[in-house]
């Protein structure tokens, strides 16, 4: 495929990445799938600067990111290492809370109203943010 050098329409460019901010809600898995179909991934936050950028665009609204622990360890959807990477959890989070009574704990991470992170039930219909990197090979054939 060709290299993507500018962001698609309705996406916001920032620091060589493109971001798309939903205005509706989906379960984490559906949001994850949506981003993949756009040749992107749920947002992966790698710095305080990126955190502030995303936070500015989403406002005080629960919003999914590309971080989950559905198979045990916390994992970023693009393979970024969780252990050594940026973290911005709320105090006492993640807590894998079982008190919601929906079965299981809390396996998916989201931005809370103040931007800090919380783990929650993955089925909750939150907004989401997709991210794709500029200069990465796109899946579309080059224009002739």
């Amino acid at each position: 495929g060709s290299e993507r050098t500018c962001c698609p329409v309705n996406w916001v460019e920032h620091e060589r990445s493109c971001y798309w901010f939903s205005r509706s809600g989906k379960a984490w898995a559906d949001a994850d799938n949506y981003c993949r179909l756009e040749d992107a991934h749920l947002v992966v936050v790698t710095s305080w600067e990126e955190q502030k950028f995303v936070q500015h665009h989403i406002g005080p609204v629960n919003t999914w990111m590309g971080l989950h622990d559905q198979n045990g360890p916390w994992k970023w959807v693009d393979g970024t290492d969780y252990e050594t990477g940026f973290k911005n959890w709320r105090p006492e989070q993640p807590d894998d809370w079982y008190g919601h009574g929906l079965g299981g704990g809390e396996d998916c991470a989201h931005f809370t109203d103040d931007g800090r992170w919380n783990d929650d039930v993955c089925q909750r219909p939150y907004r989401w943010v997709c991210e794709t990197e500029l200069d990465k090979a796109s899946q579309e054939p080059p224009l002739l």
């Epitope: 622990d69 198979n71 045990g72 360890p73 006492e92 989070q93 807590d95 894998d96 079965g103 299981g104």
Partner: antibody, heavy 115, light 107 residues
Framework: EVQLVESGGGLVKPGGSLRLSCAAS????????MNWVRQAPGKGLEWVSS????????YYADSVKGRFTISRDNAENSLYLQMNSLRAEDTAVYYC????????WGQGTLVTVSS | DIQMTQSPSSLSASVGDRVTITCRAS??????LAWFQQKPGKAPKSLIN???SLQSGVPSKFSGSGSGTDFTLTISSLQPEDFATYYC?????????FGPGTKVDIK
């Protein structure tokens, strides 16, 4: 590499106390729920207690409620189990394990309650 | 509390055999099920979580399936190192509960 190492087991008389420790390394301890699971000699596995990453959610098996206290020190990457009013039926190997699905286990520490 | 049962409680098999162990929950647990292998004198080792996700480093001869109340662990071709006791565990709700175990020994 994820590592969990238990210590503090030993022989104690009925009614006595013991404090188990679990030293964690190789992962961001403060991001994970931790559990204690035990296994009586020749028996199966029994979940004992769980604690969330920031101590806000704590759960106990009915068999130990009111006698055992789970705690953690995220600064020290350590998990603890304070066991009071010990009974013969508490005799077991005690394991610490990570997350609800127990994806990693320590080697265990033997607690023997006997007069 | 959710009761977990396993069948069979023990089985004898030969190297190369395909082995299937069943785990049943007394009520629905979605896919919140883990499988463990334990050898005598050793700590349990995680094989599978979320009913079918292979734990990192576990060989692909192990597979898990099921959802709701009925689950299976399959070993596609039994090897000498696989003779052990296998446990299932539900983590859908507290108290977490384990099955009684299935001992796999040499025929």
């Amino acid at each position: 590499e994820v590592q969990l190492v238990e210590s503090g087991g030993g022989l104690v008389k009925p009614g006595g106390s013991l404090r188990l420790s679990c030293a964690a390394s190789g992962f961001t301890f403060s991001s994970y729920k931790m559990n204690w699971v035990r296994q009586a000699p020749g028996k199966g596995l029994e979940w004992v207690s769980s604690i969330s990453s920031g101590n806000s959610s704590i759960y106990y098996a009915d068999s130990v409620k009111g006698r055992f206290t789970i705690s953690r020190d995220n600064a020290e990457n350590s998990l603890y189990l304070q066991m009071n009013s010990l009974r013969a039926e508490d005799t077991a190997v005690y394991y610490c394990a990570r997350v609800s699905s127990n994806d990693y286990w320590g080697q265990g520490t033997l607690v023997t309650v006997s007069s | 509390d959710i009761q977990m049962t396993q069948s069979p409680s023990s089985l004898s098999a030969s190297v190369g055999d395909r082995v299937t162990i069943t785990c049943r929950a007394s009520q629905g647990i979605s896919n919140y099920l883990a499988w463990f292998q334990q050898k005598p004198g050793k700590a349990p080792k995680s094989l599978i979580n979320a009913a079918s996700s292979l734990q990192s480093g576990v060989p692909s001869k192990f597979s898990g399936s099921g959802s709701g109340t009925d689950f299976t662990l399959t070993i596609s071709s039994l090897q000498p190192e696989d003779f052990a006791t296998y446990y299932c565990q539900q983590y859908n709700s507290f108290p977490f509960t384990f099955g009684p175990g299935t001992k796999v020994d040499i025929k």
